[in-house]
């Protein structure tokens, strides 16, 4: 029961985590910036992995997608890749884990197969979570180091002058969503791996038994002994009836005239 609960909880936690990773990847608020030096109105700038947006105090919002793939910083491309890999692995992990759930019966699937699938999905969730955490952390590091800031404050460009306005970009909501989602996916994956250990069928331990009759009048009754499964109450192969049968441990070393086995 505990194994099923652990597996089910791991699945749900991972599901929430992957949904969060997808949400974070799609969100525009990866970095945010408040402008107080704007001569017109309060303007709020924010950017995501795919587009940049500006929102005014009047409520007007305009977003534009990043214009080129080749011109984007390698770090941004790396973050995109990490998040997408995380989503893909997580999605595959979810698909595998659905079939691995103990509460779901599909054909005559062995417990060992379910255990393997649970372990596979667990590992996928762990890697997925790590990808998301890594991606978000790389982006956060980009913001902290202000890598885009040019040393020259003003320079002449084509068709006029360009002036870099000193600004500070802060962590957007998507970073926190990504960190939490990555963490949940990671925890879910660990839970699946733990559940896998409980799902793996234990080897049935059959002890060798020799039967001894105390007299010719005593007949062997089939089913008198039970093989140990590790779960029954008869775990020590105790005698169920006193018909002279003994386990190998209890066999006397001296011979008996009544021995026929």
């Amino acid at each position: 029961m505990a194994v099923t609960a652990c597996q089910g909880l791991g699945f749900v936690v991972s599901l929430i985590g992957i949904a969060g990773i997808i949400a974070a990847t799609c969100m525009d608020q990866w970095s945010t910036q408040d402008l107080y030096n704007n001569p017109v109105t309060a303007v709020f700038n924010y950017q995501g992995l795919w587009r940049s947006c500006v929102r005014e105090s009047s409520g007007f919002t305009e977003c534009r997608g990043y214009f080129t793939l080749l011109g984007l910083p390698a770090m941004l491309q790396a973050v995109r890749a990490l998040m997408i890999v995380g989503i893909v692995l997580g999605a595959i992990g979810l698909l595998v884990s659905i079939f691995a759930l103990k509460c779901i019966r599909i054909g005559s699937m062995e417990d060992s197969a379910k255990a393997n699938m649970t372990l596979t999905s667990g590992i996928m969730f762990i890697v997925s979570g790590l990808c998301a955490i890594a991606g978000v952390s790389v982006f956060a590091n980009m913001l902290v180091t202000n890598f885009w800031m040019s040393t020259a404050n003003m320079y002449t460009g084509m068709g006029g002058m360009v002036q870099t306005v000193q600004t500070r970009y802060t962590f957007g909501a998507a970073l926190f969503v990504g960190w939490v989602a990555g963490g949940l996916t990671l925890i879910g994956g660990v839970m699946m791996c733990i559940a896998c250990r409980g799902l793996a069928p234990e080897e049935t331990n059959y002890k060798a038994v020799s039967y001894h009759a105390s007299g010719h009048s005593v007949a062997y009754k089939p089913g008198g002994f039970k093989a140990s499964t590790g779960f029954g109450s008869n775990t020590k192969n105790k005698k169920i009836y006193d018909g002279g049968a003994r386990t190998e441990d209890e066999v006397q070393s001296y011979p008996s005239k009544h021995d026929y086995v």
Epitope: V40, Y46, V54, R64, Y66, W148, Q163, V165, Y169
Partner: nanobody, 121 residues
Framework: QVQLVESGGGLVQPGGSLRLSCAAS????????MGWYRQAPGKERELVAI???????TYAPSLKGRFTISGDNAKDTVYLQMNSLQPEDTAVYYC???????????????WGQGTQVTVSS
């Protein structure tokens, strides 16, 4: 690279009108605002008018409603309609776009090369 192309300047008589336009082209992301500044000979560059993408405007108090700024978001173009021009309006007019590139390049002010407006009889 962003380029600003200004047009519409020239010589006009006092009381006349002119319409300046400034079109931005290139890899433009989030435009915070578009505006016009002017610099008269021997003076500091001063604000004329600014418009945001949402249509919020700010004007220099000295203009007394003679100038009107407008923008075309689809064309990334800003216009300045100047009416009742006076000799003191003679200056080089610069258009300005404040563009936010975020993680790709920070916040930048782009300036046109300027267009000469001369008000003289």
């Amino acid at each position: 690279q962003v380029q600003l192309v200004e047009s519409g300047g020239g010589l006009v008589q006092p009381g006349g009108s002119l319409r300046l336009s400034c079109a931005a082209s290139g890899n433009i992301l989030s435009i915070n605002y578009m505006g016009w500044y002017r610099q008269a000979p021997g003076k500091e560059r001063e604000l004329v008018a600014i418009i945001t993408r949402g249509g919020s405007t700010t004007y220099a108090p000295s203009l007394k409603g003679r100038f009107t700024i407008s923008g075309d978001n689809a064309k990334d173009t800003v216009y300045l309609q100047m009416n009742s021009l006076q000799p003191e309006d003679t200056a080089v007019y610069y258009c300005n776009f404040r563009i936010n590139f975020g993680i790709l390049g920070g916040l930048r002010d782009y300036w046109g090369q300027g267009t000469q407006v001369t008000v003289s009889s």
